[in-house]
Interface confidence: low
């Protein structure tokens, strides 16, 4: 009922709670002397469904038959309207529309851990939209019965608060849930189980790992479990991996040896437990243990390359370069690299440990046969050395690869191609493609990059440390035993016209011709590989087209003679530079007048 209903009543038949689709009769009746003040025939009773008028009647009572009410609660209010006054609320009623409960499905019970309590869950089925009470009943051996009720509108879980113990692990228990509301009741199918079926062990705890003799091959995982656990499953993975390795073990008694871990790798370990081979369920996974495996001596061999530079008649500079071992080869933190330089005929050897670098430069005599061995060392030992005999890599002209070309291949890639050397191509054991930024000074501090290619390959895609708008000096070496031949080319991955022209710094007169000298364009303004320089000149104050001389670009060249100028004529000269993409703007202009005799 709504409010105090002092003036009248609203009755609902057959009930305030009805089945979806049922018809309901609503009667609104005034109490004696509660109608309009003067004329009771003027009483106008109005029935509202929520705030919408659905029926009215003049008199002391109103009957209305209502159908098609939706699931849930509908509010009906009866009001009285008199002449010249506001409507007065008489009374109201709520009607609850719902359905009988469906049979609860998938009843399942679980006890978390040997000390936990039995809790059951089920699926309620569709919502009844009515107050529904659930009763969970558990019957066990010796006619024992436990019962628990749940009055929550959305009840699908109940904890009995009782603990099943393993005294009789095979004893049967039966659970059943019954749902009851005003429109009916329904019970689930019974669920029968034993202690072993429903006890779900707690996840293992106190997980530790031990490496005997600090060796990854002698690794034992330890953990603690509840007393009745029979089975464990272990899963582990490197921390940077998404894939787990899985191991199932029986009667592990809280320890298991792992044989396939990689050295110097952080792993994540988790363990789960179960009481019985085929009954019951696995525990949740334990909390993760994260641990790093110990180092092992490095495996694999360093990729080593070198450069020779002539210093003077008796000395040469050797620069050694090597690439880091992969993580799986280093098998630990590389503490230093050991470089051994040996003169093969005299047997003299020099060993040096290099820390923090992957290169080493030394000066040795030009005479003698020299070899180097480079190995990487971590806390457990050294990799086997890479041995290289130092030779003149470009000495064998017949081994030089032919028709070397370098073409841009997409963003920051250069495709290098070549033809095998004229000498028996089958003699080639491998090709090495080497590249470094071109610096006019031939700076030996510029980083060197290289890759090795099998003897049957005639192309290589270079992408490591390749920047746009930078020119690279690329060499292809063909190696055969203790001989090598090489060819070189300039290449870039992306180019455009240079940003500036060369700066003429001097013009000197020599026997009737002039020698122009210029400063190289800064590397960052070259915008790729330069192909040509152009020298332009024209008579001062003349409107004629300038003459020009085009010179092929050579790294070290920074002067050029011109012998077609007339004496005692003042000329204006300037220079430009060209890449494959176009010509730079002018460099500076210089005036010059040749003093020599006229022809």
């Amino acid at each position: 009922k709504i409010d105090a209903c002092k003036r009248g009543d609203v009755t609902v038949k057959p009930s305030h709670v009805i089945l979806l689709g049922s018809t309901v009769n609503i009667t609104c009746s005034l109490k004696p002397r509660q109608g309009c003040f003067h004329y009771s025939r003027r009483n106008k009773l109005i029935l509202y469904k929520f705030d919408r008028r659905i029926n009215f009647h003049h008199g002391h009572s109103l009957n209305s038959q209502v159908t098609g009410l939706p699931l849930g609660t509908t509010l009906f209010v009866c009001k009285l309207a008199c002449i010249n006054s506001d409507e007065i609320q008489i009374c109201g009623a709520e009607i609850f529309v719902g359905v009988a409960p469906e049979q609860p499905q998938n009843l399942s019970c679980i006890q978390k851990g040997e000390q936990g309590t039995v809790a059951c869950t089920w699926e309620r089925g569709r919502d009844t939209h009515l107050y529904t009470e659930y009763t969970l009943q558990l019957s066990g051996p010796k006619n024992l019965t436990w019962q628990k009720q749940c009055k929550d509108i959305y009840c699908d879980y109940l904890d009995f608060g009782i603990n099943l113990t393993p005294e009789s692990p095979e004893s049967n228990f039966t659970a059943k849930v019954t749902a009851v509301n005003s429109l009916g009741s329904s019970s689930s199918l019974p669920s029968t189980f034993t202690f072993l079926d429903i006890v779900r062990p707690l996840p293992p705890w106190d997980i530790r790992i031990k490496f005997q003799k600090a060796s990854v091959s002698r690794c034992t995982l330890y953990w603690r479990d509840e007393g009745l656990v029979l089975l464990n499953r272990l899963r582990y993975r490197p921390s940077n991996s998404r894939l787990w390795n899985m191991v199932n073990v029986t009667k592990a008694k809280g320890r298991h040896d792992l044989l396939d871990l990689k050295p110097f790798t952080e792993y994540e370990f988790q363990i789960s437990s179960k009481l019985h081979l085929y009954k019951g369920s696995w525990s949740d996974w334990s909390e993760s243990l994260r641990a790093q495996t110990p180092e092992e001596e490095p495996t694999g061999m360093l990729d080593v390359w070198y450069m020779k530079r002539h210093i003077d008649y008796s000395r040469q500079q050797i620069s050694l370069f090597w690439k880091n071992l992969s993580v799986s080869e280093a098998r630990g933190k590389i503490l230093h690299y050991q470089v051994t330089l040996q003169e093969l005929t005299g047997g003299k050897a020099m060993t040096q440990n290099i820390t923090g670098h992957t290169s080493w430069t030394t000066v040795i005599p030009r005479t003698g046969n020299w070899a180097v061995a480079v190995s990487a060392a971590n806390s457990k030992g050294s990799s086997l050395p890479t041995r290289i005999n130092i030779m003149n890599l470009c000495e064998a002209g017949l081994l030089a690869p032919r028709q070397v070309s370098a073409n841009s291949e997409g963003m920051d890639n250069i495709l290098v191609t070549w033809q095998p050397p004229r000498k028996d191509p089958s003699a080639v054991q491998e090709y090495v493609v080497e590249w470094r930024e071109l610096h006019p000074g031939g700076d030996t501090q510029v980083p060197l990059n290289w890759l090795r290619s099998r003897p049957y390959n005639v192309s290589a895609l270079i992408s490591e440390n390749i920047k746009s708008y930078i020119c690279y000096e690329i060499r292809v070496y063909a190696l055969s035993g203790d001989q090598g031949g090489c060819s070189s080319i300039l290449g870039n991955s992306k180019h455009k016209a240079p940003l500036s022209g060369p700066h003429i710094n001097a013009i000197t007169e020599e026997k009737g011709s002039i020698l122009i000298s210029w400063n190289s364009i800064p590397v960052q303004e070259q915008m790729g590989c330069l192909l040509h320089y152009r020298i332009y000149w024209k008579e001062r104050d003349s409107n004629s087209q300038p003459q020009l001389c085009e010179i092929p670009y050579r790294v070290s060249q920074n002067s050029h003679p011109i012998n077609s100028l007339q004496p005692r004529v003042t000329y204006v000269l300037w220079m430009t530079a060209l890449t494959a993409a176009g010509e730079s703007s002018h460099g500076n202009e210089r005036e010059f007048c040749l003093q020599g005799k006229a022809n």
Epitope: E297, T299, A349, G381, S382, S383, L384, R387
Partner: nanobody, 116 residues
């Protein structure tokens, strides 16, 4: 101090076999990579083979690959070189060395002569 004693050399016909041993003392043998090197008459030292400290990884110079096998017994502090299909060009003094490069301490060597 480091002591290395090679043994097992001798005269053998081409195609024959020999096993050289190297007894080590004075250092932690099981923590060191080891190698075999040789010196043919009138020539410089030539690296032959290396073996990692645990014995799991071995490397050989091309000319002996498939014919020679290096092994070690860390419990006995002994290094071995099993030589099969011997050729006249294998004639040399063979040394074991306390390093993976062959440039470390060496023993006195053992003479291997391959001749018919």
């Amino acid at each position: 101090q480091v002591q290395l004693q090679e043994s097992g050399g001798g005269l053998v016909q081409p195609g024959g076999s020999l096993t050289l041993s190297c007894a080590a003392s004075g250092f932690t043998f099981s923590s060191n990579a080891m190698s075999w090197v040789r010196q043919a008459p009138g020539k410089g030292l030539e690296w032959v083979s290396s073996i990692s400290s645990g014995g799991g990884t071995t490397y050989y110079t091309d000319s002996v690959k498939g014919r020679f096998t290096t092994a070690r017994d860390n419990a006995k502090n002994t290094l071995y070189l099993r030589m099969n299909s011997l050729k006249p060009e294998d004639t040399a003094v063979y040394y074991c060395s306390k390093s993976s490069t062959g440039s470390g301490s060496r023993g006195q060597g053992t003479q291997v002569t391959v001749s018919s």
